[in-house]
């Protein structure tokens, strides 16, 4: 049929919870492009109708609850003006969550089960949750060795867990838990981790690398709305913290009360070698205040920002 | 290193109950599951149950449930399995196991309890 | 519950040889949740084989696993002496957990 066929790594997943894939493939999917996805080589198409317990929603394929039935080899196949690729998804169910029982439990930990916490330092854990727009999805909570987190060391930020002061005691089994509204219905997320302590100042000394923003200006005009992307490239298995700041605060903190700017959710695309995550910040409308400073891109060590200027006057207008 | 290290051999006689320590050291106590299991004498590993010793969570095996009773102590690493309404069958070797997490597998052993029970 | 089933019951063969011990379940089971162990008299068990073809720690590679579905095996390429113990095969895929009865392997 003339499809070039790419085989992505094998996703394990839990059982009685909701679970989505992107049929995302950068470049292919960047363009226009048409997304079908299919079940084990089957002629037909995967549902679209949002009633169904498994459907395509957009380029994703979702399913609300997987069930353990629903393992096998899932393709999507992309189809542009001049090309065909087919995506090849190997699905493993596991029945049950560890802190339930340890029978029919998670074998062989992929990358995203795996996070690691760098002692006396700052850090933080992500909760991956992958969801299309269609799915809403409740605060996070953070559990350690099957019991709720709470300390004055740990917060919670949108997907992440801050942990202050790492200590060799915050390794462990983690899990973090959600509530996902699809139609109206509510059904739980629960995600293990296992988190190892590291001394390591990095991952294998390896730096995230900001691809934008540039340490540039943008010019932009007073009163308008504005989203900036900050894209960082950084290796599979890291955990450092991807955030927007400003005089060194959190965004989300330094305008909690107006909420005029904020950091949008996180998302991540992956790469064989690397994942490439983009965090934006919205300006919902852009004040006198807002020019002169530095919004600060933060990705582990790594630091870029951007400078709001007014657009320099267009003499044509008069 | 990683060790489990169980209670010395007992002798019950029939209806009453034993209780058997685990004390482990050199991992994270209440990172693993703790999986009990049963050999009597001549005879094959038959499951009696887990216990998750952080939420104290336990699973039995339907044959054993209502006897047998997991606990725990974390403040000294020790994990408890209790056998109650002893009978002449429950003459056995009793192993305590740990599951790691994304290991579903038993790679370390306590060396073993032997209970008997006799009149 | 999953019955798991060993044959032969007891293997007699000499130092040198191969032995091919076999384990079959009443229902499918999982790749990930198929293990071996070994047992020798007044010792604990110790894991042999996990995940129907991974070898625990410290393991020679003259042991090695295989097999999918209902029928495992275990296999020692070339016995020595100390190979000589009862083992079992185990499924954690579901409650109850259970064992094979278990395969003595005696010196001939």
């Known amino acids: 049929d003339g499809c070039k066929d790419i085989f992505m790594k094998n996703e394990i997943l839990s059982a009685s919870q909701p679970f989505a894939f992107n049929c995302t493939f950068p470049p292919i999917t960047s363009g226009e492009v048409s997304v079908t996805w299919y079940k084990n080589s089957s002629k037909i198409p995967v549902s679209k109708i949002i009633q169904s317990r498994i459907h395509q929603d957009e380029t994703w394929i979702l399913f609300l609850p997987m069930e353990w039935g629903d393992s096998g080899v899932y393709q999507c196949v992309i189809k542009g003006r001049d090309s065909c690729h087919r995506i090849h998804v190997n699905l493993t169910v596991f029945e049950k969550h560890w802190c339930d029982t340890s029978i029919g439990g998670l074998p062989n930990l992929s990358d995203e089960y795996k996070q690691i916490l760098h002692l006396g330092k700052d850090d933080s854990l992500t909760c991956h949750l992958h969801f299309p727009k269609s799915c809403v999805l409740g605060p996070i909570k953070w559990y350690k060795d099957c019991n709720e987190i709470k300390g004055e060391r740990f917060t919670v930020l949108e997907t992440r867990l801050l942990v202050s002061n790492v200590s060799a005691e915050d390794r462990g089994n983690y899990a973090c838990q959600a509530i996902l509204t699809h139609s109206g219905k509510q059904y739980e997320v629960l995600n293990g981790i296992t988190v190892s302590i590291t001394e390591r100042a990095g991952y294998g000394g390896s730096v995230p690398k900001i691809i934008y923003p540039k340490n540039h200006s943008i010019e932009v005009q007073l009163g308008t709305t504005l989203i900036v992307d900050c894209n960082v490239t950084d290796t599979k298995d890291n955990t450092n913290l991807r955030c927007w700041r400003v005089n060194n605060t959190l965004v989300d903190d330094y305008y909690d009360e107006s909420k005029r700017i904020r950091e949008g959710v996180e998302t991540h695309v992956s790469f064989r070698e690397h994942n490439l995550y983009t965090v934006n910040i919205t300006f919902l409308e852009v004040k006198m205040e807002d020019y002169g400073l530095p919004f600060m891109c933060h990705a582990g060590v790594s630091t870029a920002y951007i400078i709001l200027q007014l657009p320099a006057p267009d003499f044509r207008a008069y | 290193q990683v060790q489990l290290v169980q209670s010395g051999a007992e002798v019950k006689k029939p209806g009453a109950s034993v209780k058997v320590s685990c004390k482990a050291s050199?991992?994270?106590?209440?990172?693993?599951?703790m999986h009990w299991a049963k050999q009597a004498p001549g005879q094959g590993l038959e499951w009696i149950g887990e216990?998750?010793?952080?939420?104290?969570?336990?699973n039995y095996n339907q044959k054993f449930q209502g006897r047998v009773t997991m606990t725990r102590d974390t403040s000294i690493s020790t994990a408890y399995m209790e056998l109650s309404r002893l009978r002449s069958d429950d003459t056995a070797v009793y192993y305590c196991?740990?599951?790691?997490?994304?290991?579903?597998?038993?790679?370390?052993w306590g060396q073993g309890t032997l209970v008997t029970v006799s009149s | 519950q999953i019955v798991l089933t060993q044959s032969p019951g007891t293997l007699s063969l000499s130092p040198g040889e191969r032995a091919t011990l076999s384990c079959r379940a009443s229902?499918?089971?999982?790749?990930?949740?198929l293990h071996w162990y070994q047992q020798k008299p007044g010792q604990a068990p110790r894991l042999l084989i996990y995940?129907?073809?991974s070898r625990a720690t410290g393991i020679p590679d003259r042991f090695s696993g295989s097999g999918s579905g209902t029928d495992f095996t275990l296999t020692i390429s070339r016995l020595e002496p100390e190979d000589f113990a009862t083992y079992y095969c185990?499924?954690?895929?579901?409650?109850?957990?259970?064992f094979g009865q278990g395969t003595k392997l005696e010196i001939k």
């Open positions: 995940s129907t073809s």
């Open positions: 229902s499918s089971v999982s790749s990930s949740y």
């Open positions: 185990q499924q954690f895929q579901s409650s109850p957990l259970t």
């Open positions: 050199g991992y994270t106590f209440t990172s693993s599951w």
């Open positions: 216990i998750h010793p952080n939420s104290a969570k336990t």
């Open positions: 196991a740990r599951v790691d997490y994304g290991k579903p597998w038993f790679a370390y």
